[in-house]
């Protein structure tokens, strides 16, 4: 069959018909519908929403829509024993207690089942002791404390401000430093943009607002009790002591009103420099302990949360491909929220809903995509990407053979300034070409393309006239598809101006104030940014599912591989004598990159010239493109991180949200001067160079002429 036989719409109009069907008003309506009550993972409300979405996707015209359920470890506060933190005097009396809940936003005072702020998967405990302020609790913050300031966190309760890195990394760092508890708080320096009012009068965080979130260090494992395998009816579950990634010390989040009360009494060392000061009217002393008059007072945590195996539900919709039904393009985003999910995730779920509706409309008119499109509404993303990971574990054999691409669809907005894209280099040209065809929603760019406004506002640091596209890290549902399975992946959303707004994420992230009204009043009243994101995400899915030749350009991978090789080499060259002493050479890696570049170039030439009417040759070339991402997977995984298997990219070991290139080599080199046994440490660097060079060379060979 030619690719047109599947459709009664001419190829030129396919994409246009799909994009024209997307409506801002529908996204707005769907967002409202999805945000009226909380949809916490594992609750009846979220199950009901799953069934509603299943029903609506069927109505929209998908071929099949099924629920896929799993029984995974979740975490909830104890309803009768609330979590809180207190200051206690020498007699053990509680002289100050933190809030038990956030003041509800206007109009939501009578909503039940709002989960109070908590750190999901915190163990129970009531530690008491002196406080140490650890800034953002990053690796470098603990280096500063322990190495430069000689401050020992062992046996202390640490207080860290949210921001810069994933909260799970903060907790891991605190544990390694010997802390016995962690208090996380939102500092106005990071969560209160100057000149903007706090909610409900603006989009800033009020003093009583608190960020919820999980504090796991799963490293891609999914359900902590069933790593590597689906949490199904016959699953063998680990004991809680063997569970993956659980924190070992109590953790609790607070807002900045409560943080003020703890930090204002801090004594001990002064902050080492201005980068350790936030915006509260407190000295930001590091401690340990309180100052003079208050030195006999201690901090006590009261944490009573419980971990429970609970059923979760993914919704999986299928639109069968007409020509290559065994090739899957996946659009997925999560449905579960901490509270109302006004931005995270429902601004994304509403966009997915409208994309499904548009595809369904085309299908009802007789059109089908060339390849199968799978739509997913994931559950329990907030508890560690559990729904997506369990489904991928259950379907891994199909996915690794049939998975063409995964497009993620969490929050559509984190600001309203410009587009933000993170994706595999294979998708760079797809994203560039698509955004050149879409209209910019930005003020001052009327009649201009999205590509133009995006490039102007977020230029590439390397290539003039091109927009910035970032590496994929983690912290969202693409993780299992990209980092574990090696399926080409991408994500897009509208973002803030990172130059002028240095706060982390958006201020109301994971708080009770993330409501429909937040979006409708302050972020996107016309829902034009949501529509643009729908066009980008939907357009990518459309092209990936419908283009005759897969819209992947392997030459872009060659370019970044050279850049990443240069970067890691320059890091290593900070140790010239050791490179000489231990005979460390990057020649094999640079040689492999050179070979990849040459082979990719030849492959691209063949791609222009081959006979596209020959279905066998077409399928062969497309398979080489599809399997290229897969070729970067090392079946053994990265050291101590078996589910991070991509050799070119992995989540940073110091910040799950960030992507790191050549992560095996990077981690081997990190802080290498502090390793006690240099011969062993440099031996591991050499091994990682070998693994990387072999992988790049092996990937290159998958693009060679097959015979």
């Amino acid at each position: 069959k030619s690719s047109n036989e599947a459709t009664n719409i001419t190829p030129k109009h396919n994409m246009k018909a799909f994009l024209d069907e997307l409506k801002a008003e529908n996204i707005k309506k769907f967002l409202y519908n999805f945000t009226q009550i909380p949809h916490l993972a594992g609750t009846e409300q979220n199950f009901q929403l799953a069934k509603q979405i299943q029903s609506q996707w069927k109505e929209f015209g998908l071929d099949s829509v099924e629920l896929a359920h799993y029984d995974v470890l979740l975490s909830y506060p104890n309803k009768t024993h609330p979590n809180y933190i207190s200051i206690i005097n020498e007699d053990g009396n509680e002289i100050f207690n933190t809030s038990l809940f956030e003041p509800p936003p206007p109009g939501y005072e009578n909503v039940s089942d709002i989960v109070p702020p908590f750190s999901a998967f915190s163990p129970q405990g009531m530690p008491e002791g002196d406080l140490v302020y650890v800034n953002y609790a990053r690796t470098e913050d603990f280096f500063k404390l322990e190495r430069d300031m000689k401050i020992n966190c062992s046996g202390k309760i640490v207080i860290a401000r949210y921001g810069k890195v994933f909260r799970g990394n903060k907790v891991k760092n605190a544990q390694l430093a010997g802390a016995k508890g962690v208090i996380l708080y939102s500092d106005p320096a990071d969560y209160f943009a100057p000149g903007v009012k706090s909610y409900p009068d603006g989009w800033n965080l009020p003093g009583g607002g608190v960020q919820r979130g999980n504090i796991l260090n799963l490293n891609g494992a999914g359900d902590p009790l069933t790593p590597g395998y689906p949490a199904n009816e016959y699953a063998y579950r680990r004991g809680i002591a063997e569970a993956v990634g659980l924190p070992s010390i109590p953790v609790h989040p607070i807002g900045y009103y409560d943080a003020q009360k703890l930090l204002e009494k801090m004594g001990g060392s002064a902050p080492p420099d201005s980068s350790w000061r936030g915006s509260l009217k407190v000295p930001y002393n590091v401690g340990p302990g309180f100052t003079g008059n208050f030195s006999t007072q201690k901090v006590k945590m009261h944490i009573h949360s419980t971990n429970e195996v609970t059923r979760i539900y993914n919704v999986i919709g299928t639109l069968r491909g007409a020509v290559e039904p065994d090739r899957y393009v996946i659009l997925g985003g999560h449905r579960d929220s901490w509270v109302f999910g006004g931005i995270d995730p429902q601004s994304g779920a509403a966009v997915v809903h409208e994309i499904v509706r548009s595809f369904g409309t085309l299908k009802k008119e007789g059109w089908r995509p060339r390849r199968t499109i799978l739509f997913a509404s994931w559950d329990a993303e907030e508890f560690g990407l559990l729904g997506s990971t369990e489904w991928a574990e259950e379907n891994s054999r199909l996915l690794q053979e049939r998975g063409v691409a995964y497009i993620n669809a969490d929050s559509s907005i984190e600001g309203n300034y410009t587009l933000r894209v993170d994706c595999t280099p294979l998708m760079y040209s797809l994203v560039h070409n698509l955004t050149k065809e879409l209209k910019s929603p930005d003020e001052g760019f009327e009649g201009k393309s999205l590509y133009e406004s995006w490039t102007k506002k977020s230029p590439s640091p390397e290539f003039s006239g091109m927009p910035r596209i970032s590496k994929l890290g983690s912290g969202n549902d693409f993780e299992v598809f990209f980092q574990r399975l090696g399926i080409a992946s991408g994500r897009a959303r509208y973002t803030k101006n990172w130059e002028t707004n240095k706060f982390s994420g958006y201020p109301l992230y994971h708080s009770v104030y993330e409501t429909y009204e937040l979006v409708e009043k302050f972020y996107d009243p016309m829902f034009k940014y949501h529509l643009t994101v729908a066009q980008v995400r939907g357009g990518m899915v459309f092209e990936l599912a419908n283009s005759i030749v897969l819209p992947f350009d392997c030459r872009d991978y060659a370019v970044v591989l050279r850049k990443y090789a240069d970067k890691i080499y320059s890091i290593s060259m900070k140790h010239p004598q050791e490179m000489k002493t231990y005979s460390v050479s990057f020649d094999s890696l640079f040689s492999a990159v050179k070979n990849f570049t040459e082979i990719a170039s030849k492959f691209s030439e063949r791609l222009q010239d081959f006979d596209k009417s020959n279905p066998i040759v077409l399928r062969m070339m497309n398979d080489q493109l599809m399997f290229l991402e897969r070729a970067f997977i090392d079946p053994l995984g990265l050291p101590d991180r078996p589910f991070y298997r991509h050799v070119i990219y992995a989540p940073s070991s110091h910040n799950k949200y960030a992507g790191e290139s050549f992560p095996g080599i990077y981690d081997a080199l990190f802080d290498i001067e502090s390793k006690v046994d240099p011969s062993k440490a440099w031996g591991e660097v050499k091994r990682q160079i070998y693994v990387a060079a072999f992988t790049v060379q092996a990937a290159a060979e998958t693009l060679s002429e097959v015979a």
């Epitope: 190495r147 430069d148 000689k150 020992n152 062992s154 010997g178 900070k574 140790h575 010239p576 004598q577 050791e578 002493t581 001067e673 502090s674 006690v676 046994d677 240099p678």
Partner: antibody
């Protein structure tokens, strides 16, 4: 191969001064924290001082027994670390070893004798 | 200051025997403990770091264990060249401190 070579030891009178040196080779000296450790038959091994790398602002730390009397310094261009010892006492008599961070590599030592 | 106490001060061994040397810290030092071997007229050489990791080039008859306050160096089958002095040391906090040493002698 990592090598540390101390020099400059000898006999000095109580109250006198002495500067001992250590030249390093086989590693990128500027990245590493360096220590002086001394050894006597009576007291055994005793850590004396540490100097950190440029990325740690060349921070220095001293044992209480020598604080105010010794200064540790380094010259990364010469891959050298020094220990300037003032107001020397009989109890400072020892073999002084230059060591790399974590005391994973030691020089052969230089003997300092404080005696009248 | 953290005091590192080694005992016994000396012990006798025959070739092929299994020997256990003990080091006790006066307070918790995690696993920041190293063991050193010193031969006559030579400087100390690292054997074990991080309480249980064998340093490069050290024969596998040497092993370390322990955490917190109690640490052990084990020589599974003593050789003649092992009959020298052994020291433990902590790098957990300032000032870095060493034990008084254990001398292994011929039985």
């Amino acid at each position: 191969e990592v090598k540390l070579e101390e020099s400059g030891g000898g006999l000095v009178q109580p109250g006198g001064s002495m500067k001992i040196s250590c030249v390093a080779s086989g590693f990128t000296f500027s990245n590493y924290w360096m220590n002086w450790v001394r050894q006597t038959p009576e007291k055994g091994l005793e850590w004396v001082a540490e100097i950190r790398s440029q990325s740690n602002n060349f921070a220095t730390h001293y044992a209480e027994s020598v604080k105010g009397r010794v200064i540790i310094s380094r010259d990364d261009s010469k891959s050298s670390v020094y220990l300037q010892m003032n107001s020397l006492r009989a109890e400072d008599t020892a073999v002084y070893y230059c060591t790399r961070r974590w005391n994973n590599f030691w020089g052969q030592g230089t003997t300092v004798t404080v005696s009248s | 200051n953290i005091v590192m106490t080694q005992f016994p001060k000396s012990m006798s061994a025959s070739a092929g025997e299994r020997m256990t040397l003990t080091c006790k810290a006066s307070e918790n030092v995690g696993t920041y403990v190293s063991w050193y071997q010193q031969k006559p007229t030579q400087s100390p050489k690292m054997l074990i770091y991080g309480a249980s990791n064998r340093f490069t080039g050290v024969p596998d008859r040497f092993s370390g264990s322990g955490s917190g306050t109690d640490f052990i160096l084990t020589i599974s089958s003593v050789q003649a060249e092992d009959l020298v002095d052994y020291y433990c040391g902590q790098s957990y906090t300032f000032p870095y401190t060493f034990g008084g040493g254990t001398k292994l002698e011929m039985k």
